[in-house]
């Protein structure tokens, strides 16, 4: 199996994490996609997901998380706005493809959120960085409960995150043929 790697972001409270997950266009364009947190000793837990089938360029908002799937470009944009210290933790994008196990998108994201006024537009009320005008058509998608038949033999890396999430969890294994690329933070 390919070694799992992490990309680390160190941000201040109030800023926005903004990443995009690239996927193989032909295979996964309309597949449902999800943003997950990996807590210490637990299986990945879904925080937000796109609709099924995933709609093109259609924002889905769950709390402070916004997902947008751009089919034509093969990428899922994930934003976590108005970051809080307790959002710190390990995250990943996955693609649902039942009955098979979800695909994980490289790389996992290690988010470190620290207290304090950052002095950047990310912490200002007037900033476009953390004040997103979500279209009125924004939807909340229901994330499926997906249990892998396999078990995890090793606990995921330690995470300090404690995030309020929907009641859906996903077990997944290591599929790492897809690349994740950072965008604006």
């Amino acid at each position: 199996a390919t070694k799992l790697t992490e990309e680390k972001y160190e941000l201040k409270e109030g800023q926005t994490l903004d990443v995009k997950c690239d996927y193989t266009l032909e295979k996964f364009a309309s597949s449902q996609k999800a943003w997950q947190i990996i807590r210490d000793g637990e299986m990945p837990k879904t925080l937000a997901c796109t609709e099924r089938p995933s709609k093109n360029s259609h924002p889905v908002q769950v709390g402070r998380i916004i997902l947008e799937d751009y089919h034509d470009h093969g990428l899922l944009r994930v934003r976590m706005v108005n970051l809080q210290v307790e959002d710190s933790g390990l995250y990943q994008c996955v693609i649902y493809q039942p009955p098979k196990e979800p695909h994980m998108l490289f790389d996992r994201i290690r988010l470190v959120v620290t207290k304090g006024f950052s002095g950047t537009p990310g912490s200002n009320e007037n900033s476009t960085q953390n004040v997103y005008k979500i279209p009125p058509t924004t939807t909340k998608a229901l994330c499926p409960l997906y249990t892998s038949p396999r078990t995890v033999t090793q606990a995921p890396p330690k995470s300090t995150a404690d995030v309020s999430t929907p009641d859906s969890e996903i077990n997944l294994t290591n599929v790492t043929d897809i690349i994740r690329v950072p965008v604006f933070n």
């Epitope: 944009r77 476009t128 690329v181």
Partner: antibody, heavy 125, light 107 residues
């Protein structure tokens, strides 16, 4: 091979505006951050802001936020930087640069890897 | 904003010298740091990205190291074409910021 070609030199009066264009040829345009960086005479490089054409929402450095407007037109593969209320200290070379894109390494953000040739803007009365 | 402080601001060196430039971030930026070479009348050129990855086409005498707040650009054996100004730049968090530059001059 991606190339960024900028518009020509401009001479402007204080208080006026200038709009510099940056046209991409070759490669993908929509999913890259197109950044604008300037260098005033005798000064260092300064990041002004940038935009991902696909997403359309610009991000600005705080000191330029009130005066700069960055836009992009996907159909013509062109990014624009408009700076208003010009003053003499805005005299500088303005560069556009490609910010990042998909890659084959784990660190798939490549820095500002492709730059335009620069546009000299002179503000003088 | 994250402040990037380079040192020295200028240095004089001879061809063949080993040159080291440091860059310090005012807060942690993980490995999200790039180094650029800039010559008068030309566009800046990316040398190093992600703190230590060599950009395609850049000679191997250039190397980068560091993570968190302290970073280093090293030119193992200075060549005549290396005399220029060098900048570090962070892209861990918006707004991206550059160091003030280090001018490498001929001794």
């Amino acid at each position: 091979q991606v190339q960024l070609v900028q518009s020509g030199a401009e001479v402007k009066r204080p208080g006026s505006s200038v709009k510099v264009s940056c046209k991409a040829s070759g490669g993908t345009f929509s999913i890259y951050v197109i950044s604008w960086v300037r260098q005033a005479p005798g000064q260092g490089l300064e990041w002004m802001g940038g935009i991902i054409p696909l997403f359309g929402t610009p991000n600005y450095a705080q000191r330029f936020q009130d005066r700069v407007t960055i836009t992009a037109d996907e159909s013509t593969r062109t990014a624009y930087m408009e700076l208003s209320s010009l003053r003499s200290e805005d005299t500088a070379v303005y560069y556009c640069a490609r910010g990042h894109g998909p890659g084959s390494s784990h660190y798939s953000y490549y820095g500002l890897d492709v730059w335009g040739q620069g546009t000299t803007v002179t503000v003088s009365s | 904003d994250i402040q990037m402080t380079q040192s020295p601001t200028s240095l004089s060196a001879s061809v063949g010298d080993r040159v080291t430039i440091t860059c310090r971030a005012s807060q942690g930026i993980s490995s999200w740091l790039a180094w650029y070479q800039h010559k008068p009348g030309k566009a800046p050129k990316l040398l190093i990205y992600a703190a230590s990855s060599l950009q395609s086409g850049v000679p191997s005498r250039f190397s980068g190291s560091g993570s968190g707040t302290d970073f280093t650009l090293t030119i193992s054996s200075l060549q005549p074409e290396d005399f220029a100004t060098y900048y570090c730049q962070q892209y861990n968090s918006y707004p991206w910021t550059f160091g003030q530059g280090t001018k490498v001059e001929i001794k």
